[in-house]
């Protein structure tokens, strides 16, 4: 089992431990080997104390166990004897956060250590590019987030304030939407939403690229490029390429490099080079028609990042097509 | 032998600080938890604390908590119980006691008097 | 906390009798209580711990049961040299707590 967990040392038996919403961790414990061993785990709260695990006599006691914590704790049997006292504890919520305090006796020793245990919650944010009549907006969307996220903006690298946050769920995990009015705006533009808790950061980037202007029958060549500075190599990530019609987005292509496989939804699509570098993604759109007119959107995505290329495509209609009518 | 050694009596001023002593000999002093109890004729024996010295961890009773503070020096084999602010309330005999949960060996006990 | 409760203050009993001394804990402690002596001028000493278990050297006229909330700490034929001040303590959980104790006089 992996368990996801940072370990903070604090002095005088305490330690801070941080986990993830939903997935499962370890409160650790120890003392020295001895013998007819006791061993509560509490819950500490303002008010009161809550069994959380109990042993003695030779086996896990769960009679006095508070009701939130059935089926989700246990621990390691086998290893008590080696000075082991450690919580297993399963489906990490908000609400188990707060001080736990594992008390363990022996024939010749009795200690108490205090594990203080954090629960952060982050998935993985998104930046959306939307149209709305004349205007366009930028969004960096967190679905859910425990604590409140630290979310800055920036314009060509230069911090900006200027973005209308929205936000629900009132204790948390919250669901965050930063958006930005970029409407006429040929600049560049970075999201950046940090966890300080599971000291995790998300950066989505936006780039509108010089407007293409191509005949008819025509092929158009729209760059996008993996930037070496936001990803690491071992790093999952997608690609998808996308036209935006009417504030509508529909899929060209999506690539995923887990599996190396591409989907193409549109046969005049190709990529420009092989992919053998996976870095550079740009596209050829072939045999061009006046209704490929608009704008086209590569979105290269990972845990970390969202690099968004906006292409504006004008296609003109050729000499003869102009002649013949 | 298992013995715990402790200063018969200690006379202190109210407001004044004392430390008190316990050494251990006849056993591996790091390997054991030492508590102390206090013993007043109106509450009997009351555990105020204990230390365990192979890594100093220490638990307290709530109500002593700020009263009293437990430390260990493993090289001379002594536990040392301090009790800050002193009131009359806290003239009283006081043992400290080797073991786990229970005490098997007992000083002979340190009797405090908070006298002006 | 789990609050130690000897009901009887005094015990008053004769040399060759058999007397029980009663504690109860104001939560099941399943039989982690253990018993002391004291005798006057002298430091408390462990008669019994795990609610039945003889401490090395005492006497097997000490004999302690129970368990959960009750329990018991008998001595089988008294003699004048266990007059003394006995208490409980349940080594369940900290705090630990002793009882009040139980002054045991010889007629």
């Known amino acids: 089992i992996f368990l996801s967990a940072f370990f903070t040392y604090v002095p005088m038996n305490e330690q801070i431990i941080i986990g993830r919403l939903g997935e499962d961790i370890i409160l650790p414990s120890s003392f020295e080997r001895g013998s007819e061993v006791v061993i509560h785990w509490k819950y500490q709260d303002s008010y009161n104390s809550y069994n959380v695990h109990s042993y003695y006599k030779g086996s896990g006691r769960l009679e006095s166990q508070d009701t939130r914590y059935a089926n989700r704790t246990s621990l390691f049997y086998n290893e008590i004897q080696n000075g082991n006292a450690s919580l297993f504890f399963r489906r990490l919520s908000l609400l188990d956060e707060g001080i736990y305090t594992c008390y363990v006796g022996t024939a010749i020793q009795a200690i108490t250590n205090k594990v203080v245990l954090k629960v952060g919650v982050f998935l993985t944010p998104m930046m959306k590019y939307e149209k709305r009549n004349t205007n366009s907006f930028l969004i960096c969307n967190v679905l859910s987030v425990y604590p409140r996220p630290i979310i800055t903006w920036k314009m060509d690298n230069t911090p900006i304030s200027e973005n209308n946050m929205q936000e629900t769920g009132s204790l948390g995990p919250f669901s965050i939407n930063s958006t930005l009015n970029i409407t006429g705006s040929n600049s560049s533009y970075e999201c950046t939403i940090e966890n300080s808790l599971l000291k995790q950061t998300w950066t989505g980037r936006w780039t509108m690229k010089d407007g293409l202007h191509k005949m008819q029958s025509e092929h158009v060549s729209l760059s996008c490029e993996l930037v070496n500075d936001y990803f690491s190599p071992n790093q999952d990530f997608k690609v998808t390429w996308s036209r935006m019609e009417s504030g509508i987005s529909s899929i060209l292509a999506y690539y995923l490099s887990s599996s190396q496989n591409t989907t193409f939804y549109e046969s005049r699509f190709s990529w420009n080079k092989e992919l053998k570098n996976q870095s550079d993604f740009s596209m050829n759109l072939t045999d061009l028609s006046l209704s490929d007119s608009g704008e086209y959107l590569c979105n290269i995505s990972s845990d970390e990042y969202t690099l968004l290329t906006i292409h504006t495509v004008h296609v003109e209609p050729s000499q003869e097509t102009a002649s013949d009518n | 032998q298992e013995q715990l050694q402790q200063p018969g009596t200690e006379l202190v001023k109210p407001g004044a600080s004392v430390k008190i002593s316990c050494k251990a000999s006849?056993?591996?002093?790091?390997?054991?938890?030492m508590h102390w109890v206090k013993l007043t004729p109106g509450q009997g024996l009351e555990w105020m604390g204990t230390?365990?010295?192979?890594?100093?961890?220490?638990s307290y009773n709530q109500k002593f908590k700020g009263k009293a503070t437990l430390t260990a020096d493993k090289s001379s084999s002594t536990a040392y119980m301090q009790l800050s602010s002193l009131t009359s309330e806290d003239s009283a005999v006081y043992y400290c006691?080797?073991?786990?949960?229970?005490?098997?060996?007992w000083g002979q006990g340190t009797t405090l008097t908070v006298s002006s | 906390d789990i609050v130690m409760t000897q009901s009887h203050k005094f015990l008053s009993t004769s040399v060759g009798d058999r007397v029980s001394i009663t504690c109860k804990a104001s939560?099941?402690?399943?039989?982690?209580v253990a018993w002391y002596q004291q005798k006057p001028g002298q430091s408390p000493k462990l008669l019994i711990y795990?609610?039945?278990t003889r401490h090395t050297g005492v006497s097997d006229r000490f004999t302690g049961s129970g368990s959960g909330t009750d329990f018991t700490l008998t001595i089988s034929s008294v003699q004048a040299e266990d007059l003394a001040l006995y208490y409980c303590?349940?080594?369940?959980?900290?705090?630990?707590?002793f009882g009040g104790g139980t002054k045991l006089e010889i007629k």
């Open positions: 006691a080797r073991g786990g949960y229970y005490f098997d060996y």
């Open positions: 006849g056993y591996t002093f790091s390997s054991y938890s």
């Open positions: 230390i365990y010295p192979g890594n100093e961890n220490t």
């Open positions: 939560q099941d402690v399943s039989t982690a």
């Open positions: 795990w609610a039945s």
């Open positions: 303590q349940q080594h369940f959980d900290i705090p630990y707590w």
